[in-house]
Interface confidence: medium
């Protein structure tokens, strides 16, 4: 197998103190076939509340590559193809789970991450505030 | 929390041959404020494309709860508030990273995996095959 | 997009050398490990050797080392492997990829090449 210089700061799997550390195993399971967001459907260029998908690198992440959603307009998209303002797109937004070196550069410690992303944008009726 | 009894056949931290691992520290940190989807927004009530949000609860997972959308209709919201079927209403999915106790039951011991979860749904212009 | 291009492959003898070569696009080279793996025929895929970003550290599978060098060249999004006293059981489709943090992951790999040893 691969062994790994050890990084002399790197926490220790036996060291007691080391604050709620789990081992897990990288053979990760996928239920999934298609992982390309881009491929897996063409809802973004569909959408009554289109959306791009931007690329959110940071080789320090796992994964390390997460795409993000955009809407491409205000508005949305009437049957005649036009931008009607009287309706708003807005992105549908998940808290996704990554994996983050912790201590940096150390090959084999991890501390869990939660961020938020935007997946794709779905067209809502605007909150009307009526003034007296 | 919950205290899950022990897997007598949970892997050993300190075993040098466990395979493929690595420690990550359950710490989060979260860049986020608000956690729960069904407060963060009424996008799911105010969409053309509305969805309810089941809760799949899962103990042997984490995070063990996690919300799915469903789309309400086939069809879209028209202006009127009925329903439109000549549009669509489909699922936004989304592929996350979860863990998975392996063996289960134990504590410190997990595996991880990729789902693929539904986050919200959104109005499509259907595609319409055409007989010749 | 991400975009690896393998080249190099060949008919070879037993004994003999092929240098691999991988192009990469579409992502910041330098900022990755990157890693050869190969799959033969009716096997499944096995990892070869992997670099780390700046080329300060390599690893190999066991039943290569000492015969085969992994290197990059940051400044031309380039990978490379080059195999010597190479055996029949070196036959196979080898496929450059871009690794992930996690040791051993990889998200994208290329089209692949394949090398055939034999007399």
């Known amino acids: 197998g691969i062994t790994i210089p050890r990084n002399p700061g790197c926490p220790n799997s036996e060291d007691k103190n080391f604050p709620r550390t789990v081992m897990v195993n990288l053979n990760i399971h996928n239920r999934n076939t298609n992982t390309n967001p881009k491929r897996s459907s063409d809802y973004y260029n569909r959408s009554t509340s289109p959306w791009n998908l931007h690329r959110n690198e940071d080789p320090e992440r796992y994964p390390s590559v997460i795409w993000e959603a955009k809407c491409r307009h205000l508005g949305c998209i009437n049957a005649d193809g036009n931008v009607d303002y009287h309706m708003n797109s807005v992105p549908i937004q998940q808290e996704i789970l990554v994996l983050r070196r912790e201590p940096p550069h150390c090959p084999n410690s991890f501390r869990l991450e939660k961020i938020l992303v935007s997946v794709g944008c779905t067209c809502v009726t605007p909150i009307v505030h009526h003034v007296a | 929390g919950i205290t899950i009894p022990r897997n007598p056949g949970c892997p050993n931290s300190e075993d040098k041959n466990f395979p493929r691992t690595v420690m990550v520290n359950l710490n989060i940190h979260n860049r986020n404020t608000n956690t729960n989807p069904k407060r963060s927004s009424d996008y799911y009530n105010r969409s053309t494309s509305p969805w309810n949000l089941h809760r799949n609860e899962d103990p042997e997972r984490y995070p063990s709860v996690i919300w799915e959308a469903k789309c309400r209709h086939l069809g879209c919201i028209n202006a009127d508030g009925n329903v439109d079927y000549h549009m669509n209403s489909v699922p936004i999915q989304q592929e996350i990273l979860v863990l998975r106790r392996e063996p289960p039951h134990c504590p410190n011991s997990f595996r991880l995996e990729k789902i693929l979860v539904s986050v919200g749904c959104t109005c499509v212009t259907p595609i319409v095959h055409h007989v010749a | 997009e991400v975009q690896l291009v393998e080249s190099g492959g060949g008919l070879v003898q037993p004994g003999g050398s092929l240098r691999l070569s991988c192009a990469a696009s579409?992502?910041?080279?330098?900022?990755?490990?990157m890693y050869w793996v190969r799959q033969a025929p009716g096997k499944g895929l096995e990892w070869v050797a992997n670099?780390?970003?700046?080329?300060?550290?390599?690893y190999y599978v066991d039943s290569v080392k000492g015969r085969f060098t992994i290197s990059r060249d940051n400044a031309k999004n380039s990978l490379f492997l080059q195999m010597n006293s190479l055996r029949a059981e070196d036959t196979a489709v080898y496929y450059c990829?871009?690794?992930?943090?996690?040791?051993?992951?990889?998200?994208?790999w290329g089209q692949g090449t394949l090398v055939t040893v034999s007399s």
């Open positions: 990829a871009k690794g992930e943090i996690l040791p051993l992951h990889f998200d994208y």
């Open positions: 579409g992502f910041t080279f330098s900022s990755y490990s």
């Open positions: 670099i780390k970003q700046d080329g300060s550290e390599k």
